[in-house]
Amino acid sequence: YKLVCYYTSWSQYREGDGSCFPDALDRFLCTHIIYSFANISNDHIDTWEWNDVTLYGMLNTLKNRNPNLKTLLSVGGWNFGSQRFSKIASNTQSRRTFIKSVPPFLRTHGFDGLDLAWLYPGRRDKQHFTTLIKEMKAEFIKEAQPGKKQLLLSAALSAGKVTIDSSYDIAKISQHLDFISIMTYDFHGAWRGTTGHHSPLFRGQEDASPDRFSNTDYAVGYMLRLGAPASKLVMGIPTFGRSFTLASSETGVGAPISGPGIPGRFTKEAGTLAYYEICDFLRGATVHRILGQQVPYATKGNQWVGYDDQESVKSKVQYLKDRQLAGAMVWALDLDDFQGSFCGQDLRFPLTNAIKDALAAT
């Protein structure tokens, strides 16, 4: 099985124990590590951070001791903006220039492939996204002709039904991608006005339609029915939780909220907590399991957080094995307890290790 793990370059800027550099990663933990994110400037793939080249080097030296490890560079992301991607993909010349710039950049910096993180193509970009993938793959095939190992091509796709329907021609893009990471998280957010788990495995009894589509099982099944081969589908598992501030004394699933949860000490983003911050939060919190959805949530005071733990990730891995998927994807290594100092287990990357162990289990 593949274990595809994202590392985010901005995690270097977190304070103190939250700061994560690629040299803190375990070279034997994942089969693929994806560095997020690269930029596109003047239609050419480019660095984003001032020290990306140094960090690329740090990441790719992990392969010295584990030659089986593959590294990919992810281009795009939330801050890149869908419109910018759209402009490049919809213009033949810009698209060509971008595609041509990729292989030399990846080879120069020691990456084994490219991950496309266009978040997200609009309904009018659907065809252009397909063309971008098809032409990128053709370029990778051509570039590998002189006996080089062919560069890998993957894409991170939304698990939201509306985005799947409007943005992706699943059957066509699947033909050209080496694997697809389906982002089976962020199904629920503060915009709903109520508490809810952002990455349920199954639809819960609490989920009235239209929430019937907001779960991992539906998204994976739908992708498969749309023509994604199970052998290319990698299922996303979050090492972060989504938090809410409760608006009343109700604390269950579907309880009213006044907004996102308070920012974490390190990640400093309202409504999001890294797993290592959740381990802190759990001291003195009340933990519940949403039985139908097979995921936990915890409450403390007026704070509510839905997250994944070692038990829920094992359920998810068993599910993806039952579905005969290609493996699991983790967003993100730097949100797991990468130092092993927060979750009291004397184990670095406890969630990712639980995923790895479950994948390896017979």
């Epitope: 329907d165 239209p210 749309l226």
Partner: antibody
């Protein structure tokens, strides 16, 4: 206020071609797909096809493929549906319909024209 | 042949609850929408995304979906609700498809 105003009723001979217009107001014409729906007398609704006014791209239902042409004129904010090789079973009310631009994926139609009756008779 | 199957007619007494069903394999994967059409008028959207009601549609109209069956429920049915009702869904293979329609008759 969103309005879709269609051209008037008409009688056509078998084998002829009919072209119906649908003029929109109250929203940006290029923001959303324009669909056409057929309703034969006493029968149900049947989706015929759509045009994306932004780029003129069309999708047609298999049943009407080859006989229907849907176009959009952005200079007048008007969509057109042309149906050729008319036969008696094409006698129907034809509606233009669109979905609100608030939705990224147009699963449904929340604005409809008043309908245009086309009678095919020799 | 319709991808979405509706009963041709449903009768209800005023003040009672009317339920109109729509079944089809695509509904397990797709949102259901419902339209009301009165004689000589254009269809009007009454439910979209399974359960959502456009502004201006009375609260007595509600929708639900379970498995491959969508249901339009009209509670406290009034004489003015007498009309034809059509379910509709989108699917990657069939594009936009309508059910055959159900004529709702309000007795009395």
């Amino acid at each position: 206020e969103v309005q879709l105003v269609q051209s008037g009723a008409g009688v056509k001979k078998p084998g002829a071609t009919v072209k119906i217009s649908c003029k929109v107001s109250g929203y940006t014409f290029t923001d959303y797909y324009m669909h056409w729906v057929q309703q034969a007398p006493g029968k149900g609704l049947e989706w015929m096809g759509l045009v994306d006014p932004e780029d003129g791209e069309t999708i047609y239902a298999e049943k009407f493929q080859g006989r229907v042409t849907i176009t959009a004129d952005t200079s007048t904010d008007t969509a057109y549906m042309e149906l050729s090789s008319l036969r008696s079973e094409d006698t129907a009310v034809y509606y233009c319909a669109t979905a609100s631009p608030r939705e990224e994926m147009p699963y449904y139609f929340d604005y409809w024209g008043q309908g245009t009756l086309v009678t095919v008779s020799s | 042949s319709y991808e979405l199957t509706q009963p041709p007619s449903v009768s209800v007494s005023p003040g009672q609850t009317a339920s109109i069903t729509c079944s089809g394999d695509i509904l397990a994967d797709q949102y259901a929408s419902w339209y009301q059409q009165k004689p000589g008028q254009s269809p009007v959207l009454v439910i979209y995304h399974d359960t959502k009601r456009p502004s201006g549609v009375p609260e007595r109209f509600s929708g639900s979906t379970s498995g491959n069956t969508a249901t339009l429920t009209i509670s406290g049915t009034q004489a003015m609700d007498e009309a034809a009702y059509y379910c509709q869904a989108w699917d990657i293979n069939t594009a936009w498809v309508f059910g055959g329609g159900t004529q709702l008759t309000v007795l009395g």
